[in-house]
């Protein structure tokens, strides 16, 4: 891909003197890795993001870039440093031959190198030419707070900021980083160039068809007139936002990324850094009718990833494709025939569809929530978005069978009141990636930094698994699931909750020798049981053991198969109380569920007994689901009896704090 000026004249031939005294060897014992987009047509060979190790200073980045140029020049290669990153990720963007990758990977401070790739606007059609006025009465929707304390950054195409729907609401920054349009005869028509961004700005904050009518926006141009951008341009845009935030700290920031490209380690890393700096990022899941985890920034765990549904709450079909799905999607939102500002004229409206429109809805809702409660953290905001969503309204048959259990059945909704949800104990379910089928394969599910892991479960479609356990990793608990010999792989399922001032620990009992089964309880004063896990080393837990029933009056105890080690998650937090709720079915059943009552939140979900015909247990909203192998293969013996065990908690402390505020 050529420079904007169309040639390589400006490429630097670095001077030999530049490399005097510089060793070529990388830092001892580290190997930098090379990454590129899995989707070949989206690759942009010749431009590379060189990511340096976390603590690298700007001066070191510049020195490393100069060293690369010098060493390349010595080999007769031209290179051009296009940008030096700092503030978000240390590193630099370089235009060079792929022949130099081996050399670049050996440079000191280099963590990894990623080939640049394309990202795309996620709306279809680009412009329908269908101009329509807003189709509802304006007074039907008058939100209590229009998001006036929040700034929403939009990384998109250029926009028509003086459109009647958004005039005065959008500040067009001077940031622009876009690739040349494809095709020699491409005609830049202003209204087409502005189409995508103008529509989304209208969906977020438009006067008449916007979600957060009071939100102010800032736009950065990272997509060209064809709706195409680059990972590197998006990275530089995110860095621009971070620098703006440092120079002039304002109130809460929401960043809307209505674009998608192939999986990108560096784009995900940049999103993580920005999120950890207190910025809320919302992105489109993608319009590829595919697993969102294969795309970026949709696959970044710190980003709120939004799929698209229609007016009937069904997943949106877009031509032969449609909304993405899977465990990387946080929730869905309206994304079909969404009316918003059209750049065709200053008073025009147009209908567009896609996960971009869905993400814009959620960005608007987020702006309103943050305006009402500016101190909300990203974790708190995400939990609230999930909590207030419409549950179980999407027809899951649209999704591929193996993705149904992983895809959240949630459609974003505005909270009935933007205040007063503080007393709730919020929890969400986080699925790991699939472990893969090897005998010792494991899968790990993690909670966000300010969430507590309150329980851990596992699931395998083949039923061949060796359970799960909670373990410490980098000072935080994670949920690890274990595959078994002959298994097709497992998922780990973490129950991640907001529990301020919590002190949680895991108590483990090794496999019992006696036939009564293994049991473990929370013995520390003031600690309550929030979840039970079991893990076993044997390939197949005995299926003919009688099911173990919990002795009455033992609410703080986990019980399990005598050949399994049992893990109890025990937590102490102000006012936290929990209870165990069980639902057992004597006859074999493919699915057994138990739900927590109103006012209580599901923190733990497990199955009794943990025998091999149980595929696993997982939480769906406030319901514990235990899945077993097909009844026809199990027969109706006693081994088919399964009990779903839910642990339901609430926090009296949060309730009291909320009442004091009101």
């Amino acid at each position: 891909q050529e420079d904007e000026d169309g040639d390589y004249e400006e490429l630097v031939l670095a001077l030999r003197s530049e490399e005097d005294g510089l060793a070529e060897a990388p830092e001892h014992g580290t190997t930098a890795t090379f990454h590129r987009c899995a989707k070949d047509p989206w690759r942009l060979p010749g431009t590379y993001v060189v990511v340096l190790k976390e603590e690298t200073h700007l001066s070191q980045s510049e020195r490393t870039a100069r060293r690369l140029q010098a060493q390349a020049a010595r080999r007769g290669y031209l290179t051009k440093i296009l940008h030096v990153f700092h503030g978000l990720l240390p590193g630099f963007l370089v235009k060079m031959s792929g022949d130099l990758l081996e050399l670049a990977l050996k440079l000191p401070h280099v963590d990894y190198i990623e080939e640049d790739s394309s990202v795309f606007a996620q709306s279809i059609p680009w412009n329908l030419e269908r101009i329509t006025p807003p189709r509802y009465r304006a007074d039907e929707y008058q939100p209590p707070d229009g998001g006036s304390l929040v700034e929403v950054y939009l990384l998109d195409t250029s926009i028509q900021s003086d459109h009647r729907e958004i005039e005065g609401r959008v500040m067009v920054t001077d940031f622009e980083n876009v690739p040349e349009e494809d095709g020699t005869r491409f005609h830049r028509q202003a209204s087409k160039c502005d189409s995508h961004g103008t529509h989304l700005a209208g969906v977020v904050s438009g006067r008449d068809a916007g979600v957060a009518k009071g939100a102010s926006m800032r736009s950065l141009r990272v997509l060209n007139c064809q709706g195409k951008g680059t990972v590197s341009g998006t990275l530089i845009g995110l860095e621009f936002i971070r620098k703006s935030q440092l120079v002039q700290p304002v109130g809460p920031l929401v960043v809307l990324l209505p674009l998608a490209g192939g999986y990108s380690r560096v784009l995900n890393a940049a999103c993580q850094r920005l999120a950890r700096a207190g910025v809320v990022l919302v992105t489109a899941a993608g319009n590829f009718r595919d697993d969102a985890c294969l795309y970026s920034p949709a696959s970044a765990p710190e980003v709120i990833t939004v799929g698209a549904t229609n007016a009937q709450d069904q997943p949106v079909t877009l031509g032969t494709l449609g909304t993405n799905f899977g465990r990387c999607v946080d929730l869905f939102a309206p994304g079909e025939d969404i009316i918003g500002a059209s750049s065709d004229c200053s008073t025009c409206f147009v209908s567009q569809s896609g996960t971009s429109q869905a993400a814009a809805h959620v960005a608007g809702i987020a702006a309103m929530m943050l305006s009402a409660e500016p101190e909300l953290t990203l974790a708190e905001l995400r939990q609230r978005l999930i909590h207030f969503s419409a549950k179980d309204v999407i027809n899951e048959a649209w999704f591929p069978e193996d993705q149904r259990v992983l895809t959240p059945n949630l459609v974003a909704a505005l909270p009935p009141s933007t205040h007063g949800a503080g007393w709730q104990l919020f929890c969400r379910t986080v699925w790991s990636a699939h472990s893969g089928p090897t005998r010792m394969a494991t899968a790990v599910a993690r909670c966000a930094p300010d969430e507590e892991l309150l329980s851990c479960s596992s699931f395998s479609r083949s039923g061949k698994r060796r359970g799960e356990r909670m373990e410490a990793q980098g000072g935080k608990l994670v949920c690890r699931a274990h595959n078994a010999f002959g298994g097709e792989g497992v998922y780990a399922i973490a129950r991640c909750c907001l529990l301020p001032q919590a002190n949680c620990s895991v108590h483990t009992a090794p496999p019992a020798e006696a036939s009564m089964g293994t049991r473990v309880h929370c013995h520390q004063q003031g600690h309550v049981l929030t979840g039970c896990s079991s893990h076993w080393e044997v390939e197949d837990l005995g299926t003919h053991k009688p099911p173990v029933l919990r002795p009455r009056g033992q609410p703080n105890q986990c019980v399990g198969h005598r050949e399994a080690s049992i893990h109890a998650s025990c937590c102490h937090a102000p006012g936290l109380e929990c209870k165990v709720k069980e639902h057992g079915i004597p006859a074999p059943q493919e699915q057994v569920t138990v739900a927590c009552e109103e006012g209580w939140t599901l923190t733990g979900c497990s199955a009794l007994p943990g025998t091999s015909h149980v595929l696993g247990a997982y939480a769906v909203d406030n319901t514990c689901v235990v899945r077993s192998r097909d009844v026809s293969t199990t027969g109706s013996t006693s081994e088919g009896a399964v009990t779903a065990v839910a642990i339901c908690c609430r926090s009296r402390h949060l309730a009291q704090a909320s009442q004091e505020l009101q």
Partner: antibody, heavy 115, light 109 residues
Amino acid sequence: QVQLVQSGAEVKRPGASVKVSCKASGYTLTSYGISWVRQAPGQGLEWMGWISVYNGNTNYAQKVQGRVTMTTDTSTSTVYMELRSLSSDDTAVYYCARGYGMDVWGQGTTVTVSS
Amino acid sequence: QSALTQPASVSGSPGQSITISCTGTSSDVGGYNSVSWYQQHPGKPPKLMIYEVSNRPSGVSIRFSGSKSGNTASLTISGLQAEDEADYFCSSYTSTSMVFGGGTKLTVL
């Protein structure tokens, strides 16, 4: 501060044309268009149209369509409104205002059409 | 003939509250959130007092408030003061343009 400064009063003969200017300052010009509104003596306000400073697009009121032309000169941050084929009915104070929201107004330009 | 209908005049004594109505149709006032109110003193340009139905620009007294029900918008001025005596105009978006009311002369007795 945000300001719109208009050109001075004009006296025109019927059938002639008038061109009124409006110089904007104190804000990001491309974030707002400019509306033109007129007020005949002792009468109410009448919206004449709007022009985009961003791309020059216009939106004219039906009543004056064909007789009015709005233009911009971004180098001087000035917007112009030209009205042709003047008649005594066009005698009015002509205002420019910021955007469709019309939150800031020029001081007004009196145009008198008299034979 | 103005598209939006306002009473020609209203009056009130200092300290009282008055309300000026602005009636349109579902194609203007009823269909959009963008109803504005302007105050105009003789020989001066109009001044924006309320925008988007009920929002007050900075610098405008809290005595001025706006509301809307169906196709009718209202401007209420509480604690009437002598300097409030002026002409008041409402405006609204239509699908492609803007319309004003005929104006209401407020007299402070």
